[in-house]
């Protein structure tokens, strides 16, 4: 059963249908919508059988409609249900207001029902002109927009319409007058020089596209000088003006073809700067110093002429940078009067010339630089100099190899000698001397000096080593030492040290009576006025005592036997054999043998007698240890 058809309006351009029907009964529904006065053809819609409501959009506003519906079940149509309803009235815009007015733009605000319009159509028309209107559209969601690009102080009529697909509201209008173009603020001249000035002005930020500056010489029909500068500037340097000249400067702002009322200021450039206060002073006997005053940053350069007063033909010209206010002029003659002139140049223009006269000083003299009393660390200097001129003397001491820092002394101008100390020994120096008086430095004179070597103690040598001693020798500077101390200590430090004091002229010491075959340390120190040098050291081992050994008895006979032994080669001068019967019944027999012998046949002894035999070697007069043996002669 299909029933309960209700129709309600959905806005001004649509209707909503609701109905009831048995669930899952219908394949689909057929809906017919027709204007009540049947002006236009009916609209048919087919909707699925599951629906129980549908919106019908796109209808005419404020129009009565007849709506019919039937269902289809297995090809069978149900009876038709019908109902009548009218669409609503079209919505109107609310009010339109101008929220903000500037001189070149305004802000438009309006009210409208939400979601009613696709867009708004706005028309901006200058009042009382036939000029084409400005048209713009804005989205239907907006309720405000800016209208830029307007003319200042101009009447405008602004209309707005809301627009849908097939409908436009009645327009709303508003009239408005844009404001005047803002005026410039203050124009001031903040800096004035002889050839330039600086303008400063105030304006609202971001207002002007550009400014036009006009610079005109007052009381002149000469063409004005125009400058256009960006609207962001508030200051401008105007160069290239004439000195001491009145100028009228005007400024106006420009914005989209509009010009402000001009601002004007009058100003007089300063007079051309002049040079002043030329002073000339002597700088030694061969130079002059010039000082002058001048305006800062004014001059390209200065031209100076220096001329001997009595020699007109030989002038010296110098061109100097415009930043200078002083210069030294060297290379002049001593005790000579000079005329000095100077002028400045400013963009090709010459200032008046300033002149002054001055004389160079008499040439002072220094000479005869002499070096004396040279020691390992010092020397004395003496020199000659013109009296009463010098305030100080400067002495520079430079080592010839340039390995040391230069030492500089400044001493009184009354001195003619100096003691230079604290120098390293055995070093070549160049001494430079110059004299200084007010504004004067003489030519430098020089001399050379070499500091003496420090006294030397070196080359400790040990020679002539033997079992009982050795010779100590060394080298030392002549006349450097009052005495030498030689100390001899055994390496094991078991014995007392032996000390030998020698005169400062001695260079060697022979040591005897030492122990054979042990180590010794030898130290040699020099003394000067009781001050001891660090010792030279050497270590040495005395030779071992030569040995006689292995005394053997063989080949016994009734009156003797053969003796043989061993001994160090090349050490002994000779050997001594002592033979005596053990009962001491006969005189002892003593035999001296030459060094190369190592055997001896002994005869003339008693038969069957026991003998005690002793053997020792002799080397350089000293006896070796004795070796002994017992031998018995054979029975007869």
């Amino acid at each position: 059963e299909l029933e309960n058809l209700t129709v309600t309006e959905v806005g001004w351009d649509g209707l909503r249908l609701n109905w009831t029907a048995a669930d899952q009964a219908y394949e689909h529904f057929i809906i017919q919508v027709q204007e009540a006065n049947k002006v236009e053809a009916a609209r048919n819609l087919t909707v699925p059988g599951s629906l129980r409501a549908v919106d019908i959009p796109g209808l005419k506003a404020a129009t009565p409609y007849t709506v019919s519906i039937y269902g289809v079940i297995q090809g069978y149509r149900t009876p038709v249900l019908s109902a009548e309803a009218s669409t609503g009235e079209t919505p109107n815009l609310g009010e339109v207001v101008v929220a903000e007015v500037g001189w070149d733009a305004l802000k438009l605000n309006w009210t409208a029902p939400e979601g009613a319009y696709e867009y708004f159509f706005i028309q901006v028309q200058e009042a009382d002109t036939v000029e084409a209107a400005q048209n713009l559209t804005v989205p239907g969601g907006l309720r405000s927009t800016d209208l830029p690009g307007l003319k200042a102080a101009t009447h405008y009529t602004i209309t707005i319409r809301g627009v849908t697909q097939d409908f436009s509201t009645t327009p709303l209008s508003v009239e408005v007058l844009t404001e005047e173009v803002p005026d410039m603020g203050n124009l001031t001249v903040t800096e004035v020089s002889w050839d330039a000035l600086r303008l400063n002005w105030t304006t609202p930020d971001g207002t002007y596209d550009q400014f036009t500056i006009q610079v005109q010489e007052a009381d002149q029909v000469e063409e004005a000088h125009n400058l256009t500068v960006p609207g962001s500037l508030r200051s401008m340097e105007i160069p290239g003006l004439r000195a001491g000249t009145p100028y009228t400067v005007t400024l106006h702002g420009e914005v989209r073809g509009h010009s402000t009322r001009p601002l004007a200021v009058e100003v007089v450039t300063e007079d051309l700067p002049q040079l002043g206060d030329l002073a000339v002073s002597e700088v030694g006997w061969d130079g002059l110093r010039l000082n002058w005053t001048a305006a800062d940053n004014a001059y390209e350069h200065f031209v100076i002429q220096v001329q001997e007063v009595n020699k007109v033909e030989a002038a010296q010209n110098l061109t100097l940078p415009g930043s200078l206010r002083a210069v030294d002029i060297p290379g002049l003659e001593a005790a000579t009067p000079y005329r000095v002139s100077i002028y400045g140049v400013i963009r090709g223009y010459r200032t008046p010339v300033l002149s002054a006269e001055a004389s160079t000083a008499k040439e002072p003299e220094i000479g005869n630089l002499n070096v004396s009393d040279i020691t390992p660390e010092s020397f004395n200097l003496s020199w000659m100099a013109t009296d009463g001129i010098f305030e100080t003397f400067t002495i520079e001491i430079i080592d010839s190899n340039r390995l040391l820092e230069t030492v500089e002394y400044n001493i009184s101008g009354a001195e003619r000698t100096a003691h230079i100390s604290g120098l390293p020994p055995s070093t070549d120096f160049i001494v430079y001397l110059s004299g200084l008086a007010p504004s004067i430095r003489t030519k430098t004179i020089s001399a050379t000096a070499t500091t003496e070597a420090l006294p030397l103690l070196e080359n400790l040598t040990i020679s002539d080593i033997n079992p009982y001693g050795f010779t100590v020798s060394w080298m030392a500077s002549e006349n450097a030492f009052d005495s030498f101390l030689v100390t001899v200590v055994d390496s094991g430090k078991l014995l007392d040290p032996q000390e030998f004091t020698l005169s400062g002229t001695q260079r060697k010491l022979e040591l005897r009576g030492l122990i054979t075959g042990i180590g010794y340390e030898v130290m040699v120190s020099g003394f000067t006025q009781g001050h001891q040098t660090k010792p030279l050291r050497a270590e040495i081992v005395t030779e071992a005592e030569p040995e006689v050994d292995n005394l053997l008895v063989s080949d016994a006979t009734p009156d003797g036997f053969r003796l043989s032994w061993t001994a160090d080669e090349g050490v002994f001068d000779n050997f001594v054999l002592k033979i005596r019967d053990t009962k001491k019944q006969s005189e002892p027999l003593e035999i001296t043998l030459l060094a190369p012998e190592r055997t001896r046949d002994i005869t003339g002894l008693r038969e069957a007698t026991e003998y005690e035999i002793e053997l020792y070697g002799i080397s350089k007069g000293r006896r070796s240890q004795t070796v002994s043996a017992i031998a018995t002669t054979a029975m007869g």
């Epitope: 450097a480 000067t528 006025q529 009781g530 001050h531 001891q532």
Partner: antibody, heavy 118, light 107 residues
Framework: EVQLLESGGGLVQPGGSLRLSCAAS????????MGWVRQAPGKGLEWVSA????????YYADSVKGRFTISRDNSKNTLYLQMNSLRAEDTAVYYC???????????WGQGTLVTVSS | SELTQDPAVSVALGQTVRITCQGD??????ASWYQQKPGQAPVLVIY???NRPSGIPDRFSGSSSGNTASLTITGAQAEDEADYYC???????????FGGGTKLTVL
């Protein structure tokens, strides 16, 4: 006990002369080298001169060379320093000192003040 | 001066202090060291390699390396506050030279 006693100091004008003496006792004077060391007011020590045991060798600092003379009389156990052409910079306490052969100055006197001023 | 010393050095009571002396002549000669208290004559405290005259406490010692000599006081006492001068030979022409002196303060 070793004693060294200086005398002869005093005030003298620049260019003037003074003779300092040092009387020694308590050691073998003739076996010791002797010397003079000075100390300007508020300054450090400065060696001036020295003489060997018998007096045959003398030594001088550059600053006094040619103006000062050291000498000794071993019979009187006395050391002398003759100072000529005195300058303001010679103003100092002058100490007499002894040293044995293998030692530096090991005993000093108490000093005598020399003032050179106009 | 041919022998160079630091003008002033300080040490806490009982601590160790080292006073140095530099000069070319110290490459060859040992330095000697003198102590001088205000208004008094100098006193020899160290000579040679490291020798002390009789009466000098063993807290004083000397050493030498290259062109530098050192005086070390181990466990400085209040009575050690004084000026200390190093001294050496400079060869035959100028046989004796002194350093400029070091003022030792014991805190």
């Amino acid at each position: 006990e070793v004693q060294l006693l200086e005398s002869g100091g005093g005030l003298v004008q620049p260019g003037g002369s003074l003779r300092l003496s040092c009387a020694a006792s308590g050691f073998t004077f003739s076996g010791s080298r002797m010397g003079w060391v000075r100390q300007a007011p508020g300054k450090g020590l400065e060696w001036v001169s020295a003489i060997n045991e018998e007096g045959g060798q003398t030594y001088y600092a550059d600053s006094v060379k040619g103006r000062f003379t050291i000498s000794r009389d071993n019979s009187k156990n006395t050391l002398y320093l003759q100072m000529n052409s005195l300058r303001a910079e010679d103003t100092a306490v002058y100490y007499c000192a002894k040293h044995p052969p293998h030692r530096p100055f090991d005993y000093w006197g108490q000093g005598t003040l020399v003032t050179v001023s106009s | 001066s041919e022998l160079t010393q630091d003008p002033a050095v300080s040490v806490a009571l009982g601590q160790t202090v080292r006073i140095t002396c530099q000069g070319d002549s110290l490459r060859l000669y040992y330095a000697s060291w003198y102590q001088q208290k205000p208004g008094q004559a100098p006193v020899l405290v160290i000579y040679g390699k490291n020798n002390r005259p009789s009466g000098i406490p063993d807290r004083f010692s000397g050493s030498s390396s290259g062109n530098t000599a050192s005086l070390t006081i181990t466990g400085a006492q209040a009575e050690d506050e004084a000026d200390y001068y190093c001294n050496s030979s400079h060869g035959p022409r100028r046989p004796v030279v002194f350093g400029g002196g070091t003022k030792l303060t014991v805190l």
